[in-house]
């Protein structure tokens, strides 16, 4: 089989500070040295890119400075963290993995992680 399998958790609950973390694991059919990981958000039938990073195997995962994502990599596993989430950002977040180099190229699409975000209740006014 030439398809690359990508696994990610079905559901994740964001913290009260709007931070959600999940692991994206891929079964690499080849020995890739350059990998690109993209987080996509699917709402209805619309798919948008949340963040993306390309890394060399053995090196750290680096997202752009203004990205809402951070991550670390270990072998065929990527630990992703998305921050700044609000209730309106609740949705399905898909992990996409591309083995860019060396040939052949492989594409792997996860089934998605449903991230639930609950906005914290505002603190009641204090009499003190």
């Amino acid at each position: 089989c030439k398809a690359m399998h990508v696994a990610q958790p079905a559901v994740v609950l964001a913290s009260s500070r709007g931070i959600a973390s999940f692991v994206c694991e891929y079964a690499s059919p080849g020995k890739a040295t350059e990998v690109r990981v993209t987080v996509l958000r699917q709402a209805d039938s619309q798919v948008t890119e949340v963040c993306a990073a390309t890394y060399m195997m053995g090196n750290e995962l680096t997202f752009l400075d203004d990205s809402i994502c951070t991550g670390t990599s270990s072998g065929n596993q990527v630990n992703l963290t998305i921050q700044g989430l609000r209730a309106m950002d609740t949705g399905l977040y898909i992990c996409k993995v591309e083995l860019m180099y060396p040939p052949p190229y492989y594409l792997g699409i996860g089934n998605g992680t449903q991230i639930y975000v609950i906005d914290p209740e505002p603190c009641p006014d204090s009499d003190f």
């Epitope: 089989c1 030439k2 398809a3 690359m4 399998h5 059919p29 350059e34 690109r36 993209t38 996509l40 798919v47 948008t48 890119e49 993306a52 390309t54 898909i94 996409k96 860019m100 180099y101 040939p103 052949p104 190229y105 492989y106 594409l107 792997g108 699409i109």
Partner: antibody
Framework: EVQLVESGGGLVKPGGSLRLSCAAS????????MHWVRQAPGKGLEWVSF????????YYADSVKGRFTISRDNAKNSLYLQMNSLRAEDTAVYYC???????????WGQGTMVTVSS | EIVLTQSPGTLSVSPGERATLSCRAS???????LAWYQQKPGQAPRLLIY???SRATGIPDRFSGSGSGTDFTLTISRLEPEDFAVYYC?????????FGQGTKVEIK
């Protein structure tokens, strides 16, 4: 409007060269990998070449390897295909295509005709 | 290289009837990586189905895809006059990206 527009096709003699261009508009070009696909007259679709987001990774069909070179200029929102040592069997309509975020080719140009004949 | 074989080569159907097109892969293709395209004379291909069964934006629900592994199917439930065209399957899970040879759906 989200679109791709190819140019640069024409009539060229065997052994000659041609450079195709594809102008992208209406989307963030650098966020997508791109392809060239061709279609010989009366035939099916044949994938020709792929280029990564930053242009560092390129793949080619065996039929064009060593003769064709794909490149991109993200600042100009443009994709290119340099075709050298052209043969009669390279005669086809050449399409540039965008890879959607989930992998299939979701946006195609109108195509540009390349005819290789003496 | 994954070779895709489409059948039949030509399908003659009357408007309003059902059309079933087949695409067989030489080795297993993950269902997330199989697409169908429609092409009319003088036009560029148009994406119909991706991920074996998901309809692309703006594609009417008379088009549906199914299958997994090596066998995939595109079904057009009730052929409209504008559906007479050539249909291609494609795998995009690994390089080289490959297309089937096409099935022409013509008016009976």
């Amino acid at each position: 409007e989200v679109q791709l527009v190819e140019s640069g096709g024409g009539l060229v003699k065997p052994g000659g060269s041609l450079r195709l261009s594809c102008a992208a508009s209406g989307f963030t070009f650098s966020s997508y990998t791109m392809h060239w696909v061709r279609q010989a007259p009366g035939k099916g679709l044949e994938w020709v070449s792929f280029i990564s987001y930053d242009g560092n990774t390129k793949y080619y069909a065996d039929s064009v390897k060593g003769r064709f070179t794909i490149s991109r200029d993200n600042a100009k929102n443009s994709l290119y295909l340099q075709m050298n040592s052209l043969r009669a069997e390279d005669t086809a309509v050449y399409y540039c295509a965008r890879t959607s975020l989930l992998g299939p080719f979701d946006l195609w140009g109108q195509g540009t005709m390349v005819t290789v004949s003496s | 290289e994954i070779v895709l074989t489409q059948s039949p080569g030509t399908l003659s159907v009357s408007p309003g009837e059902r059309a079933t097109l087949s695409c067989r892969a030489s080795q297993s293709v993950g269902s997330s990586y199989l697409a169908w395209y429609q092409q009319k004379p003088g036009q560029a291909p148009r994406l119909l189905i991706y991920g074996a069964f998901s309809r692309a934006t703006g594609i009417p629900d008379r088009f549906s895809g199914s299958g997994s592994g090596t066998d995939f199917t595109l079904t057009i439930s009730r052929l409209e006059p504008e559906d007479f065209a050539v249909y291609y399957c494609q795998q995009y899970g690994s390089s080289p990206w490959t297309f089937g040879q096409g099935t022409k759906v013509e008016i009976k």
